[in-house]
């Protein structure tokens, strides 16, 4: 697994413990919390990052209207169960035996139940809508410049293939980034849109997950793009199953 050889660190995940105990004395990094080996040449899965975070010491409108089936992560942080590949297990339970089903980005998609709750498969989140509001600027950003800069960011910083950035919408002061990635489209080695969105979310909040890199300094033709509010909507390949009680 690629890691910085000289001082043995993980460039893509600072929530790791690294040591030169890999094959041939190579640097090997393990995620905090799970102890799982991570590939430092790419993004670490959101599940392992959440687990590491929980183990750390506590301190005409062009905009898209999210579908009625879109999920927002209202439950916040929890200590997830990850499978051997670092993906979320379909069923998550807490210490009091309350269980629920999640999608591939770890967001709850069913009502909470008990240990008898069945989650037959991990449902893939194939469409993510990132909704941002930026701080005042001297004028509106040029849409095409903004589009190009955000696509460049996802390609270069998060290593997300450009084909997965479906669209960038802008209606001052709201920016929307649409990420789309079906199961059939995702090839081996492709960064998952859920992981890219999570890294972006943490960057925007000033909580970069990258080792030693400065915070995100987003600029459009030299002008800073400063985000003051972020909302992320998740759409699954199979609509979520909530009781009507939750919807009222």
């Amino acid at each position: 697994h690629t890691a910085a050889q000289d001082n043995c660190t993980c460039p893509t995940n600072k929530m790791t413990v690294c040591s030169p105990d890999g094959p041939g004395g190579r640097c090997q990094c393990r995620a905090l919390g799970s102890g799982m080996a991570v590939d430092c040449s790419t993004l670490t899965s959101k599940c392992l990052l959440l687990k590491a975070r929980m183990s750390a010491p506590k301190n005409a409108r062009t905009l898209v209207r999210p579908s009625e089936h879109a999920l927002v992560d209202n439950d916040g942080l929890y200590d997830p169960d990850c499978d051997p590949e670092g993906r979320f297990k379909a069923r998550q339970c807490n210490q009091t035996s309350v269980c629920w089903c999640v999608n591939s980005v770890g967001v709850r998609r069913t009502d909470k139940g008990d240990l008898s709750l069945r989650c037959d498969e991990l449902v893939r989140t194939h469409h993510i809508l990132i909704d941002l509001r930026h701080r005042p600027t001297a004028g509106a950003f040029n849409h095409s410049d903004l589009d190009a800069e955000l696509r460049r960011l996802f390609r270069e910083r998060y290593r997300l293939h450009p084909k997965f950035v479906a669209a960038v919408h802008y209606e001052q002061p709201t920016i929307q980034i649409e990420l789309r990635q079906n199961t059939s489209q995702k090839a081996a080695g492709d960064v998952d849109i859920g992981d890219a969105a999570y890294y972006f979310e943490r960057d925007i909040k000033g909580e970069s997950l990258f080792q030693g890199r400065g915070g995100l300094d987003l600029r459009v033709r030299g002008e800073p793009l400063q985000v003051e509010r972020t909302l992320i909507y998740y759409l699954d390949e199979i609509p979520p199953k909530f009781s009507m009680k939750r919807l009222t």
Partner: antibody, heavy 123, light 109 residues
Amino acid sequence: AVTLDESGGGLQTPGGALSLVCKGSGFTFSSYAMGWVRQAPGKGLEYVAAISSGSSTGYGAAVKGRATISKDTGQSTVRLQLNNLRAEDTATYYCAKSGYGGSASYVSDIDAWGHGTEVIVSS
Amino acid sequence: ALALTQPSSVSANPGETVEITCSGGGDYYGTYYYGWYQQKAPGSAPVTVIYDNTKRPSNIPSRFSGSTSGSTNTLTITGVQADDEAVYYCGSYDSSAGIFGAGTTLTVL
């Protein structure tokens, strides 16, 4: 600690030109908007000009067309050039730093001030 | 051009809570932005006590706080001290320029 040091004030003649310089230290100069605020004797604070980290500029109504704000990131300095001076430009001029890079909401974002330099326009 | 409205003076006894309001700032798509600046004597450098509505510089005591309700921002000084006696200016966003209020003189009795 953040420090802002102004220079260039003093006695000026009406119709002449003024050049004020502010040198910043203790912060990453290139990342923040900078600006000038003045206070005439016995009066309140007045916005003069600001420049964002990306070099977009804004000017107060009283100096628009007569003022130019610029910066030298390498030297960590911001300069205010004010032409066609009038008696009403007499004031203490303060250099101010924004807590952000953008310029449009500049006044509400000021998080640090210089000690000021006094400018007197008189014949 | 916009004009900020703030009271010309307020007074309080030491230990009391003081609130100074400021309204009339620019509306940036439904959001209003304000800052508060303390000046202890004319010609002395202002000191930022609150910027960006609620943010407090690290050198400012926690008794200073800012809050926004609609288009009005309120500077609250909890447990006012004699050293807080000063003129407080509010500042706000106005398109590509900035504006200040006329100042509120705080007298600590």
